[in-house]
């Protein structure tokens, strides 16, 4: 071995200066009576060395590196030989940092498994091999004096957490606890925990049941869940407190908290949550009034709240059939009671004789918001009730009597927009208790069947705006009836448009007399239909064989016209524009000549 | 210093009843897990039942279940063991005792014998 | 039912004496296993709990091991206060039975 490098540290703080020798032996000579010695770090050459020939022959070069930013390389001493650089030494220099204090030092006394756990931060990587040991003691007092040493705790490569066995824990006697860590360029020592391994204690959390129900116990209320938990057994003599979270499985909602509970609870029902849901629950337990760590969340449990009985209000209205004054069409419309008021799964409509104690007729039960019946003779009145699994709502009276009331007055309606209408009127005396508003298509669409309806509790209203099924360029019958105590009014109807479509045709224009320099046309009107904006004018056009254009005006129940003016027999192209408020048609073009000079009149 | 007094045993005859008390003293006693083991003359210790700290929960030994309640009175420092339809193989000394946190005995009661004879 | 066996359920030794007791739960128990002594006419006394946690007050010649289904109770040298009924007990869950002693006596 011809040469050998020698160097200050092999190991420095990342960025320090490094200083190395390479020393040739003389008998290596023969390469070169005087070789020059060059360094290499890594693949770099360096320059700087400083070449000396030394008392003994032997050849010497010395470098200083100013910075080492490499975390590791290797040095190395060379010669040129030949055309290739000869390594005669190597070494590896490695530069890094000493080891950060550890922080965040945190234990958990396991009571499955008997040990005590300890976690901690190593801090900053050091980029040398460092090693950690987690060194502990018992003490009698606050750890201010150190009884016997408990051994190291060396945990395995890479890990921020060791283990002590329980054969080296004193439960209810405190520890010291500290971490060292330790590379080539120091050691350094966390801050000393001083704990009881009971005091960090970490339980496993209870299980959560669902109350088997019992006959003698009342069912939860809506939006209520019964519930007990089976408390952890390796830690049922600990006192603790527990806390339960809870959120609907469905939507966004985040866990909502409830505690602190007892760990005993043989029963607990947890109310406050929205009927008919499935909520998930978990619950977690800490010791206490002693120190200890909170548990995990327990495995979750999936219960679902009872539904509450429909709290609505049943507005209704009815019909008789024409030719069958007994058989009944009944409608009625939900109207919650309160925010949350319940699932409606069906409506049952029933009837009870008279003289025939409890006993109730079903008369239909349907999920439909009508339903059609045969009305027994001796029947006046019926109960409609909205129901779920949890009950029925409050029966709603449907009293059948003759309209006995007076009638309101000044019905009329006018367009709002192209989907809503406004129907006003002049309320009766004595005020009513409201008013049913039926509407649905008029002729020739017109179909019972088809009606929608609203409730109008106010008795004092003059008006109603429809919103619902109005579609524009559709005529529409309204029905308004005014109810009273026990009777209601006579009906009222009227037609209208959310919005009305130019009238569809003109009337055909048909020539009567002609002349030298006159015509009489005629026409028959379109027959008016129902509830259409009537006709608001005539318009006459007339162009002559020059492309000359005349026009007149003419009111709305002009059946004919006569032309003035003309020229002897020469062409002309006549058509009728009908025109209402919401816009004008065209007739078909009637073309016609005027008779020569020398010819006689046509009548 | 932690003290517990038993009292309330004597002779009663089979299918009667007694009630057995201990006072507890030196500890806060509503925190802690009280039970009571009995052991029958020239026998070993059998457990009877527990009492969790708030009441709550009270196991019981399958040879008296259905016969003995264990209840305490966290207002008066007293646990008590309500033995109905006694019988002869309840004959024992009856020791209260603490529970510790991992369910240790910690102290006991120097003990009070029933003796179930007719 | 947690059934605890110990053995020897008697045994003789001389003071100064290294005596061993052992105790088998009938399944794992992890480390709830406590030891208890008893002299005659007299209430029981903890010695070891959560299988080698010596109870304040008791001397260190006493001590615990093992986990799981397997404990010992170990007393480095008998002394002549030691001779007494030992028993131990489970305490991971009811019913919280305990062994049927084992008696030591002077040899």
């Known amino acids: 071995e011809c040469g050998h490098i020698s160097v200050s540290a092999p190991i420095v703080h990342l960025g320090d200066p490094i200083t190395a020798s390479c020393i040739i032996k003389q008998n290596c000579s023969h390469l070169d009576p005087e070789p020059q010695i060059l360094w290499r770090l890594g693949a770099e050459l360096q320059p700087g060395g400083r070449q000396q020939r030394l008392s003994d022959g032997t050849q010497e070069s010395i470098i200083t590196l100013p910075h080492l930013n490499h975390t590791q390389a290797f040095l190395s001493c060379c010669l040129n030989w030949g055309n290739s650089l000869q390594i005669l030494d190597q070494v590896e220099l490695r530069a890094g940092y000493p080891p950060a204090i550890p922080h965040n030092l945190s234990c958990l006394m396991n009571l499955t498994t008997s040990s005590l756990i300890c976690q901690w931060e190593p801090g900053p990587e050091t980029h040398l091999p460092t090693s950690f040991t987690l060194k502990s003691f018992k003490s009698r007092g606050n750890c201010q004096t150190q009884g016997d040493s408990i051994l190291d705790c060396v945990p395995k490569d890479g890990q921020s957490h060791c283990c002590i066995p329980r054969k080296h824990l004193l439960l209810y006697q405190n520890m010291g606890i500290w971490v060292q860590a330790e590379n080539a360029l120091g050691t350094s020592m966390s801050p000393q925990l001083c704990l009881d391994p009971m005091d960090v204690v970490k339980l496993e959390p209870p299980m959560l049941r669902t109350m088997d129900p019992s006959p003698e116990a009342a069912p939860p209320q809506a939006g209520c869940l019964q519930l007990c938990w089976e408390p952890w057994q390796p830690g049922l003599h600990i006192n603790q407190k527990c806390e339960l979270r809870h959120k609907p499985q469905r939507g966004e909602a985040s866990w909502a908290l409830v505690g602190p509970l007892p760990l005993e609870a043989l029963q607990y029902e947890l109310c406050g949550l929205l009927p008919a849901t499935a909520y998930t629950l978990q619950i977690r337990c800490i010791r206490w009034p002693l120190p200890g760590h909170w548990s995990d969340w327990s495995p979750s449990l999936e219960l679902r709240t009872t539904e509450r009985a429909p709290t609505v209000r049943l507005d209704t209205w009815w019909r008789q059939r024409q030719l069958d004054p007994r058989t009944v069409q009944l409608f009625w419309k939900p109207v919650p009671l309160e925010e949350d008021s319940g699932r409606i799964q069906g409506y049952v409509v029933s009837w009870r004789p008279s003289g025939q104690a409890g006993a109730i007729l079903p008369l239909c039960n349907t999920t439909e918001l009508s339903c059609t019946f045969h009305l027994p003779s001796e029947a006046q009145e019926v109960a409609l009730v909205a129901y779920n699994s949890a009950g029925t709502s409050r029966p709603t009276p449907v009293v059948f009597s003759e309209s006995r009331g007076p009638a309101l007055t000044r019905l009329h309606a006018m367009a709002r927009d192209p989907h809503s209408l406004w129907v006003g009127w002049e309320p009766p005396n004595p005020w009513p208790q409201g008013y049913v508003i039926e509407w649905g298509l008029g002729p020739p669409s017109a179909s019972n069947s088809n009606k929608t309806w609203r409730m109008e509790q106010n008795g004092r209203a003059t008006g109603f705006l429809l919103k619902e099924n109005i579609r524009p360029f559709q005529l529409y019958e309204i029905i308004v009836t005014p109810l009273y105590q026990d009777t209601m009014g006579p009906s009222q109807h009227v037609y209208a448009y959310s919005q009305e479509m130019a009238p569809s045709h003109a009337p055909e224009l048909h020539l009567k007399h002609i002349g030298k320099t006159w015509a009489q046309l005629e026409w028959v009107p379109e027959p008016p239909e129902l509830g259409k904006s009537p006709l608001t004018h005539y318009t006459i056009f007339w162009t002559n064989a020059q492309n000359q254009s005349f026009s007149a005006i003419l009111n709305a129940s002009s059946r004919g016209f006569v032309l003035h003016g003309l020229e002897p027999a020469s062409l002309y192209h006549i058509h009728l524009m009908a025109a209402s408020q919401a816009g004008a048609t065209n007739s078909t073009v009637l073309t016609l000549m005027t008779l020569t000079p020398e010819g006689s009149e046509l009548h | 210093e932690v003290q517990l007094l038993e009292s309330g045993g004597g002779l009663v005859q089979p299918g009667g009843s007694l009630r057995l008390s201990c006072a507890a003293s030196g500890f806060t006693f509503s925190l802690y897990w009280m039970g009571w083991v009995r052991q029958a003359p020239g026998k070993g210790l059998e457990w009877v039942s527990s009492i969790s700290s708030s009441g709550g929960v009270t196991p019981y030994a399958d040879s008296v279940k259905g016969r003995f309640t264990i209840s305490r009175d966290n207002s008066k420092n007293t646990l008590y063991l309500q033995m109905n339809s006694l019988r002869a193989e309840d004959t024992a000394v009856y020791y209260c005792?603490?529970?510790?946190?991992?369910?240790?005995?910690?102290?006991w009661g120097q003990g009070t014998l029933v003796t179930v004879s007719s | 039912d947690i059934q605890m066996t110990q053995s020897p359920s008697s045994l003789s030794a001389s003071v100064g004496d290294r005596v061993t007791i052992t105790c088998r739960a009938s399944q794992g128990i992890s480390s709830y296993l406590n030891w208890y002594q008893q002299k005659p006419g007299k209430a029981p006394k903890l010695l070891i709990y959560y299988a080698s946690n010596l109870q304040n007050g008791v001397p260190s010649r006493f001590s615990g091991s093992g986990s799981g289904t397997d404990f010992t109770l170990t007393i480095s040298s008998l002394q002549p206060e030691d001779f007494a009924t030992y028993y131990c007990?489970?305490?991971?869950?009811?019913?919280?039975?305990f062994g049927g002693g084992t008696k030591v006596e002077i040899k």
């Open positions: 005792a603490k529970l510790g946190e991992l369910g240790m005995m910690q102290s």
């Open positions: 007990q489970q305490s991971i869950e009811y019913p919280a039975h």
